[in-house]
């Protein structure tokens, strides 16, 4: 479920013409296509620079993909009366580089939000919580899709991108009801320590195609509802005992670990032992060593302790320069 989807409808989409009259509650904005039967509005690939003001009140699924929105200000979707039905909002690939605090306020039914493929140089800590209170009103969001939102290096702020995203996810504890979070393809080097503790309802977490080297400081302990954890295509070298125990303790989880550069030395012994007995890891027989060279392509499940050695560290007196 990586994109907002509309229910199918045989009703035709009505392409609107620009109108001089004030907008009616069910009028279709210029450059959009609307289907009241499907409760869907599509303003796709139209180079829009701002969110249409005259969205019909019936809209449940709103596609604003492939535009040039640049900035999403506070109250970007606030209307009077409010868009009370809007449940799925897809803003992917719309050249957003700034999402300000309160951008999604006054959307009481918003369950799914997709901001993927926008180079977000600035994501306000209050983008999803709407306020700077230490505990905000709970967000209605259930699915938050933030794949490939990392900006190019020259557009990054001084602070870490990981930290900026984390701040938005934990602000005001607003996302306690979130079930799905996708953070794939964001060049994350680490996962800030406190993020997952603030997302206790997560069922699906996608961290694939990042640059995570270690999970040592990440705790999965309280994610008791987690069903899918995607860690494919990262830079993981080994999983240590603490992480293994936490994953094993999650009652429903399936973990995906493919395409990581596993280092098959003495530090891998615990992970190999765990892999042999766990049912948690999907496709575990596809995990292969990347290093050291002599172990390349060896299947982790087929290793034994004798295979997993570390080069002894020579005492200083025996080292040569």
């Amino acid at each position: 479920t990586s994109s907002a989807s509309s229910s199918s409808s045989s009703a035709p989409f009505l392409a609107s013409a620009a109108s001089a009259q004030p907008p009616l509650p069910d009028q279709c904005p210029a450059l959009c296509e609307c289907s009241e039967a499907a409760r869907t509005v599509k303003c796709v690939n139209r180079n829009l620079t701002e969110v249409p003001t005259d969205l019909p009140l019936y809209v449940r699924n709103l596609f604003l993909t492939g535009n040039q929105l640049a900035v999403l200000p506070a109250g970007a979707f606030a209307r009077r009366p409010p868009l009370a039905e809007l449940a799925a909002l897809n803003l992917s690939g719309s050249r957003l580089d700034e999402v300000r605090g309160g951008a999604f306020e006054h959307l009481p039914s918003l369950r799914q939000l997709d901001l993927s493929h926008n180079p977000l140089a600035y994501l306000s800590p209050f983008a999803f919580s709407g306020s700077n209170a230490s505990i905000s009103a709970p967000s209605p969001l259930v699915e938050l899709i933030l794949n490939h939102i990392v900006p190019p290096d020259d557009k990054r702020q001084n602070r870490s991108f990981e930290g900026m995203v984390a701040a938005a996810l934990v602000a005001g504890r607003a996302l306690q009801g979130l079930h799905l979070l996708e953070l794939a393809s964001n060049h994350f080097l680490y996962l800030p320590r406190d993020v997952l503790a603030q997302l206790p309802s997560l069922r699906y977490l996608d961290l694939s195609n990042n640059s995570l080297v270690s999970l040592t400081y990440v705790s999965f302990r309280n994610l008791t509802h987690l069903e899918s954890l995607h860690l494919e295509d990262n830079a993981l070298k080994v999983l240590h005992n603490g992480t293994l125990a936490e994953l094993q303790g999650l009652p429903h989880v399936r973990v995906f670990l493919d395409n990581n550069p596993w280092v098959c030395d003495c530090h891998m012994a615990d992970m190999v032992t765990w892999l042999k007995q766990t049912g948690v890891v999907q496709g575990k027989d596809r995990l292969t060593c990347a290093f050291p060279e002599k172990m390349r392509n060896r299947v982790l499940l087929e290793l034994n302790s004798a295979d997993l050695d570390c080069d002894p560290i020579l005492p200083p007196s025996l080292q040569t320069s």
């Epitope: 295509d233 395409n259 292969t288 390349r296 392509n297 060896r298 299947v299 499940l301 087929e302």
Partner: antibody, heavy 116, light 107 residues
Framework: QVQLQQSGAELMKPGASMRLSCKAT????????LEWIKRRPGHGLEWIGE????????NYNEKFKGKATFTAETSSNTAYMQLTSLTTEDSAIYYC?????????WGQGTTLTVSS | DIQMTQSTSSLSASLGDRVTISCSAS??????LNWYQQKPDGTVKLLIY???SLHSGVPSRFSGSGSGTDYSLTISNLEPEDIAIYYC?????????FGGGTKVEMK
């Protein structure tokens, strides 16, 4: 050193079945995936699938499901590929290779000709 | 399936030339790309794995580079024994797929 020795050339009739073999030496046979690849003139290389000999786990290219079946005999370090309902489209050179993320050692190939 | 495209099916070069062979994927493959050499006698060898790592025993005149969807193999100083067909292969997702091959011939 690692070696993969494949069975000799075969001439088969359409509709028949046949089994190619690949004997591995010089490494722990059960510790690596064993790949099968097809080469036809003008079609380049096509990945048929793979088997993990120690466990019998297999992955097939959807295109070859129902056509190819992999087995392995760990006692003799030999992998087999059975091809069924042969047609002229199956005429090709078939390679086995030691696999994983890259195929670092290849057999010499077995030429299969299907002709009536 | 991920499609791999080698846009040049054959090329002619002279001894000592620098030869570059390109390969593009239908979607990003995160550097999960290998290069193989098939000699005229049918033998196949791994040259480069994971985009740029030289397989043991392969001469240093071979090198690989690329990212995202676009990759290349370079032979810096063409030798007679380099006459062969060169294939790229992605291992990002099953089924593994190969490019159509680029035949390198001598002028």
């Amino acid at each position: 050193q690692v070696q993969l020795q494949q069975s000799g050339a075969e001439l088969m009739k359409p509709g028949a079945s046949m089994r190619l073999s690949c004997k591995a030496t010089g490494y722990t046979f059960t510790g690596y995936w064993l790949e099968w690849i097809k080469r036809r003139p003008g079609h380049g290389l096509e990945w048929i699938g793979e088997i993990l000999p120690g466990r019998g786990s297999t992955n097939y290219n959807e295109k070859f499901k129902g056509k190819a079946t992999f087995t392995a005999e760990t006692s003799s370090n030999t992998a087999y590929m059975q091809l069924t309902s042969l047609t002229t489209e199956d005429s090709a050179i078939y390679y086995c290779a030691r696999g994983g993320r890259d195929f670092d050692n290849w057999g010499q190939g077995t030429t299969l000709t299907v002709s009536s | 399936d991920i499609q791999m495209t080698q846009s040049t099916s054959s090329l002619s070069a002279s001894l000592g030339d620098r030869v570059t062979i390109s390969c593009s994927a239908s979607q990003g493959i995160n550097n999960h790309l290998n290069w193989y050499q098939q000699k005229p006698d049918g033998t196949v060898k791994l040259l480069i794995y994971y985009t740029s790592s030289l397989h043991s025993g392969v001469p240093s005149r071979f090198s690989g580079s690329g990212s995202g969807t676009d990759y290349s193999l370079t032979i810096s100083n063409l030798e007679p024994e380099d006459i062969a067909i060169y294939y790229c292969q992605q291992f990002s997702k099953l089924p593994y797929t190969f490019g159509g091959g680029t035949k390198v011939e001598m002028k």
